[in-house]
Each structure stands twice: as C-alpha cells, then as structure tokens.
Interface confidence: low
C-alpha cells in the first residue's frame, strides 16, 4: 500500500492555545502532502494547501479538534496523490473545567499488584480519557457513569510494572463534542514500589523528641540510589532528596523535618533518576513521637 503515515508531535492531546506538528511520512520518500479534516469545524489554513514534511498547527482552538488524514504527492498516481493516510484524532483540552483523579488504595503500588484510577467530576461527562505523560499513543477512552452529582469512571490497572508507572491525567468530554476535552486533572504520579532492596531509616537526635525540637531523618543504602523519597503514613505526597555518597560507602539523604509538632510513621524509598516512577521496597517504618511542650529557649 502506498498510504502515507500521519503522526502528531508531541501528541494528539493538545491544550487550547498550544501547537501541534502534523507529520506525514511517505514510504516512497515524497515529502509534499496535503491535509484534510474529516469532522468537526473546518480549518481554513488546510484548504488547497501543499505542506512540506510537516505542518505546525496552532495556536489550537476547539475548531482544530477532529480527525485528520494526509495524502502525499505521488507522481505515478493518476491524481498525483497517494491514498489517504491513517486517521489522526486531535483532541483539544481546556474546553470544560478539570475533573479529579485519584488512586485507590493509593499512588504507591507494589510490583505485580493492581491499582484503581478513579476520575470524577461534578460535570456530567459521558466520556473520560486517561493519558500518561510522555506517551504519544492515543489516550485510553473510558465510558463515564452519570449520576446526580456528576460523573465518574473507575479503571483497574495492573499487574503493576515499571512500564505502567508514570504521571497520569484524565479529561472529560461530552457526547456531541467528542474531541473537545476538559482541562486536564491535576497530575497523579503512579509509582511502582518493591523493585529493589529496602533502604534503612534513622532519626537524629532520636525518634522521640520534644515538641518544637528539630529532627532529621536519614535514609541510606549500599545500593547506588540517586534519589530518596520520604513519606509519612496517611499523608499524600513525599519529600524528595538527592542521595550523597558517604565515607562509609553508603548512599544517604538527610531530611531535616524542622521543629516537629506531630509524630507519625515514616518510611523511605530509594530510586534511580533514569526511572523516576520505579522505587525500592519501603524501609521499615520509623515511628517518630513528640512529647511535652516546646522547650523555652
């Protein structure tokens, strides 16, 4: 088949006001092409136009959302053009307000286990899209469940591997405007844990401190971890520090917690800069307890 291949860079999901490059590649090496839009609003800058190699489209508006195909120049064809390419659907985000994205039971998922990603909104979206950062393939399309308070979808993801870990966002859309999406949800980092041996966690001056006293938690390992992550049980988010090689041959990071007022169970994880969403087993939990009133200085 002499069909060319149409692709979108950096991806098919484009924020309103941003740009997208449509690239048409011919197996026969012809670099001139025409573009057509099959649905949605017309885009006048495509009409009767011949492009070379690629077309930088934007700043995009909801009018740019829709299905595109290209035809490459083909001197041996009766029309002078190839057959139409594969379709590329450009989705424009920012048209509706953003939904929320949550992970159950949480965003840190043991290797091999399953996590449920829940996207919900007070807008009645019939469709949701789930998109992983850095992936150019089409996002996952999911059917929303409508209810009085809005809409939601649950997506079960697993068994967990480093290939599934990453930064996720979800979008909502309504049936009559399928390619016009909401603003993206806040990003959700899904991390696979348990890929490497656990680091150790200790406290200076100790795990029991006076209220208002400074405490530093040290995470260390003989593994060549670049980064350590410190998390507190029942709290979202984590602290992140670069590891430093110590004289004794361990890689360590010191987390100064400052004047503490509340105790809690802490754990730390190690990871490598090249695989930011793949972490070690957690350290053994370190309970930090706070006693008495803050010391008068």
């Amino acid at each position: 088949q002499d069909k060319p291949f149409l692709s979108a860079w950096p991806g098919t999901v484009v924020s309103e006001g941003q740009h997208v490059t449509l690239q048409c590649r011919s197996r026969l090496g012809f670099n001139e092409f025409s573009l057509s839009k099959e649905d949605g609003m017309p885009v006048p800058e495509l009409y009767n136009r011949i492009f070379r190699n690629s077309f930088l489209m934007g700043p995009v508006t909801p009018a740019h959302a829709g299905t595109y195909r290209c035809c490459s120049s083909h001197p041996h064809s009766p029309t002078g053009w190839s057959a139409p390419s594969n379709p590329v659907v450009i989705m424009v985000t920012g048209v509706h307000r953003k939904p929320s994205l949550l992970a159950h039971p949480g965003p840190l998922v043991k290797s091999g286990e399953t996590v449920i990603l829940q996207c919900w909104s007070d807008v009645r979206f019939e469709r949701f899209l789930l998109h992983r950062e850095g992936i150019t393939e089409d996002p996952l399309r999911l059917v929303g469940q409508l209810h009085d308070a809005g809409s939601q979808v649950n997506y079960s993801m697993g068994p967990m591997t480093p290939a599934l870990a990453g930064t996720y966002r979800c979008f909502g859309s309504v049936t009559h405007l399928p390619y016009e999406l909401s603003a993206p949800s806040d990003p959700l980092d899904i991390v696979v844990v348990g890929l490497y041996g656990k680091p150790s966690l200790s406290a200076q001056p100790g795990p029991t401190v006076q209220a208002g006293e400074n405490v530093t938690l040290s995470c260390s390992s003989r593994s060549l971890f670049d980064i350590y992550h410190l998390s507190r049980e029942a709290e979202a988010g984590e602290l992140r520090l670069t590891a430093v090689l110590r004289v004794n041959g361990t890689f360590q990071a010191n987390f100064p917690l400052g004047p503490v007022t509340h105790g809690g169970n802490y754990r730390c994880f190690g990871s490598f800069r090249a695989l930011p969403h793949a972490w070690s087993d957690p350290s053994d939990p370190l309970p930090v307890s706070v006693t008495g009133n803050s010391r008068n200085l």
């Epitope: 860079w9 941003q18 740009h19 800058e45 136009r49 070379r52 690629s54 930088l56 934007g58």
Partner: antibody, heavy 119, light 107 residues
C-alpha cells in the same frame, strides 16, 4: 513580552566570515521553524534560510544565492538561532532579521543586525 | 521562484483617505499571501495573513482581499501611524518571496 534580538553584524571584507545570532523570548521557541530574512536596497526583503523542528530532524533550506556559503543552526535550550556566513560577497550587505515561521507567514520580527561587506 | 510584483513603489495620500495597495504573484498562490508593515525606524510587523485574516492587535481599518494571483491591502481611513512601507509575501512555496514594497507618504 515577545522579543527577537539579533546580534553579530558589522563590517567584513569580501571573502570573510561572520556568525549572526538571534535570541528569542516570550514564545515557545522549539515549536517554530526559524528563518533568516535579509533586506537590502538592491534586492528588498529576501528570504535566506530556514531551520525546522527537532521532530523534523532540524531540516534546513536555503535560498539559491547563499547555498553552500551560509549555514543555519539552532539551540532550543538557549532559544537561539544562528547564521554562519562564509565567503561573503558585496551583495550580501544588508539588514538581517531572524523570524519564526507559522502557517504561511513570519509573525514576529526583531530589529535586525546590519552586515556590511566591503573592502 | 514565484515573483511578487508591487507595481506602485510609492503613493501619497491625506489623513482619512482610503488607500489600496496591490500585489501580483507570477503564479497562483492559493491565498497564501501576507502583508507586512515596515515603519521608518525599520520595525517590521505582520498585518494580515492568508489574504484577509488580521493578525492579533491590528486595527480593523486594515483589510485584505484577493485570490489566485491578484491581491490587495486596503487602509480604509489613513492615520498618521500608518505612514510606512508595505510588503506582500507569498507563503505557498519555497523559497518564500516578497514584493519590492509600496511606500505610503503624506500629501
């Protein structure tokens, strides 16, 4: 605020070399094909060279009058585009502007830098 | 290469006048015609692209029209700040080419 700032112009002898630089700010530089356009009293405005995006493998195109003598390059990390000019001729004299290309036009222009080729 | 011809190199007009500048391409450029304004200090600004679409921030007294090979730029009500040289440019085919310019002066 959107800005394009050309530099590197000046007086050069025929056969000499010169490198022009242009620093951009206020727009997503890496999303735009970048161009150099020259203006002279004899030839008016004249498109000189174009460099495309990383996704286009930084493909370049040149006007016939400068092919083989001029080289356009870019550094997206510095939002900069360059024009290396070798074997300069008197007819290369003019004001050189760097400008991004969008759709079919050059939407933003800098103040230009003057290149004078003279003995 | 596509040649762009602006037959009028300069014209004189009074403030408030309607001014039309024409541009002809040596072959059909499918409406990929742009107009630029260059002020006496050398500043270049895109006014109109794709024959008739006003660039953001350009006042509506400027308009463009044409098709095929013949295009024009109209200033409906000339103002002092419009005193400049106007260039047409085709964006249909490499190499992109410009007209020689039309200088608008005050009578």
């Amino acid at each position: 605020e959107l800005k394009l700032e050309e530099s590197g112009g000046g007086l050069v002898q025929p056969g000499g070399s010169m490198k022009l630089s242009c620093v951009a700010s206020g727009f997503t530089f890496s999303n735009y094909w970048m161009n150099w356009v020259r203006q002279s009293p004899e030839k008016g405005l004249e498109w000189i060279a174009e460099i495309r995006l990383k996704s286009n493998n930084y493909a370049t195109h040149y006007a016939e009058s400068v092919k083989g003598r001029f080289t356009i390059s870019r550094d997206d990390s510095k939002s900069s585009v360059y024009l290396q000019m070798n074997n300069l001729r008197a007819e290369d004299t003019g004001i050189f502007y760097c400008t991004p290309f969008y759709g079919s036009s050059f939407p933003y222009w800098g103040q230009g830098t003057l290149v004078t080729v003279s003995a | 290469d596509i040649q762009m011809t602006q037959t009028t190199s300069s014209l004189s007009a009074s403030l408030g006048d309607r001014v039309t500048i024409s541009c002809r391409a040596s072959q059909d450029i499918s409406n990929y015609l742009n107009w630029y304004q260059q002020k006496p200090d050398g500043t270049v600004k895109l006014l109109i692209y794709y024959t008739s679409i006003l660039q953001l921030g350009v006042p509506p007294r400027f308009s463009g029209s044409g098709s095929g090979t013949d295009y024009s730029l109209t200033i409906s009500n000339l103002e002092q700040e419009d005193i400049a040289t106007y260039f047409c440019q085709q964006g249909n085919t490499l190499p992109f080419t410009f007209g020689a310019g039309t200088k608008v002066e005050l009578k």
